[in-house]
């Protein structure tokens, strides 16, 4: 922590300017007025501070404000939004999109992920849901922000909002994301033809329960292996050969690249062999012909 | 990372003139500004002049008129100009460069070069 000293009378400061740059830690720390640097907070990211004076002003600020900073403050924080820390973050209710624009701008490139993804959080619990323009927020200037968001935060898009969501913006998301995604967007999609809805659900199938992956296979999609690959295991293992081969139509070959890799290995293992054989990939791993497939989980749900 | 390498110090007569430079290398991308520093026997390290990316300066109070900073962009290279020099400007000067973004943002520091104003 920065040692108190009073302040020298020619060193008293009576607004933020650049002379402060000359000013030592201890300078800083006794000469400058916590309310004068939230009241000129704008002006602070334009003066050329050393991280280490940066360091000072945060501890003004947050002695100033020890439950959080106000969002006049927050909106005007610039680089030293790089200082904050996801506890810091957790103190602070945003509801303005322009602060939430401005502080991604600052962290672009940073490794800032839990502070990014704790501001995001601050932002949807003070807007009260996660709504179309605060989604046209995230996906223009911060692709990929949106699955830094948990579940239960997820579970406020309203399906209307769905269609501003682009692939991009869920190559991070998780299962548990797509779990409470997927719903939503096949509600957003439902009146969409057949090949016009498989393009707009692909993204979000990591979601799908196994009866609207079967449903998908009637309907000659040609699912490409990099979406197979992302389906739920769960949803993947109860599907037939047949059926595999009619979701993946001409893309069905990638099924021996993806070989030894789940959910394609575990689902192997679920086939008869001479199933397996009829698709011509030389598959390995199916149950053998003349074996007794025993389901014991049924068993012992019913004991 | 970010490198920075001064050179130009060495002995001087009172009122004399030095140059000294400074040349950044590696991350070199986003600084935002350089500036240059002293230590001189038995003190803290000072800040003698500051320019920023958009070429505005700033001078102590101690050697405003007699130092003058300017950057070359192009070069990654800040210069400092000091005229009418004192004994009491003797020091190891120092340049800092700092980042504000990626991919390594905070402040950057030379290994120093020894200037001595004595008769």
């Known amino acids: 922590d920065v040692e108190r000293t009073t302040c020298p009378p020619e060193k008293e400061v009576h607004e933020i300017d650049e002379s402060l740059i000359f000013y030592k830690k201890r300078e800083l720390e006794a000469c400058v007025d916590a309310a004068l640097l939230a009241a000129q907070m704008d002006r602070v990211d334009a003066i050329p501070f050393t991280y280490e004076q940066l360091d000072v002003l945060k501890h003004k600020l947050d002695e100033l404000y020890p439950q959080g900073y106000p969002e006049s403050v927050i909106r005007h924080l610039g680089h030293l939004f790089l200082k904050m820390s996801p506890e810091d973050i957790r103190k602070w209710n945003v509801t303005s999109l322009e602060t939430l624009k401005a502080l991604l701008k600052v962290s672009k490139g940073h490794e800032m992920s839990a502070q990014v993804a704790t501001l995001i959080d601050r932002v949807v619990v003070g807007r009260g849901q996660l709504d179309k323009d605060t989604v046209d927020t995230l996906t223009a200037f911060c692709p990929g922000c949106l699955c830094s968001l948990s579940p239960e935060r997820l579970s406020s898009v309203p399906p209307s909002v769905i269609g501003a969501v682009r692939p991009q913006d869920l190559d991070t998301c998780g299962p548990r994301q797509l779990d409470v995604l997927y719903p939503k967007a096949r509600l957003a999609f439902q009146n969409m033809s057949g090949s016009e809805y498989f393009v707009k659900i692909r993204p979000f199938l990591g979601g799908a329960p196994t009866e609207d992956v079967k449903a998908l296979s009637q309907q000659n999609v040609s699912m490409d292996l990099a979406t197979f690959m992302k389906l739920r295991r769960e949803a993947v293992l109860p599907l037939t050969v047949a059926e595999v081969q009619k979701l993946l139509g001409p893309h069905v070959e990638g099924l021996k690249v993806e070989e030894q890799h789940s959910p394609v290995r575990d689902w192997i293992l679920k086939q008869r062999q001479d199933d397996l054989d009829t698709l011509g990939l030389g598959l390995q791993g199916g149950i053998p012909n003349g074996y007794l497939i025993l389901d014991l989980s049924v068993r012992e749900a019913l004991s | 990372q970010l490198q920075l390498v001064e050179s130009g110090g060495g002995l001087v007569q009172p009122g004399g003139s030095l140059r000294l430079s400074c040349a950044a290398s590696g991350s070199v991308n986003s600084i935002t500004a350089m500036g240059w520093y002293r230590q001189g026997p038995g003190n803290e390290r000072e800040l003698v002049a500051v320019?920023?990316?958009?070429?505005?300066?700033s001078y102590a109070d101690s050697v405003k008129g007699r130092f003058a900073i300017s950057m070359d962009n192009d070069k990654h290279t800040v210069y400092l100009q000091m005229d009418s020099l004192k004994p009491e400007d003797t020091a190891v000067y120092y340049c800092?460069?700092?980042?504000?973004?990626?991919?390594?943002?905070?402040?950057?520091w030379g290994q120093g070069t020894q200037v001595t104003v004595s008769s």
């Open positions: 800092n460069a700092h980042r504000r973004t990626w991919p390594h943002p905070g402040d950057y």
């Open positions: 320019i920023t990316d958009r070429g505005r300066a």
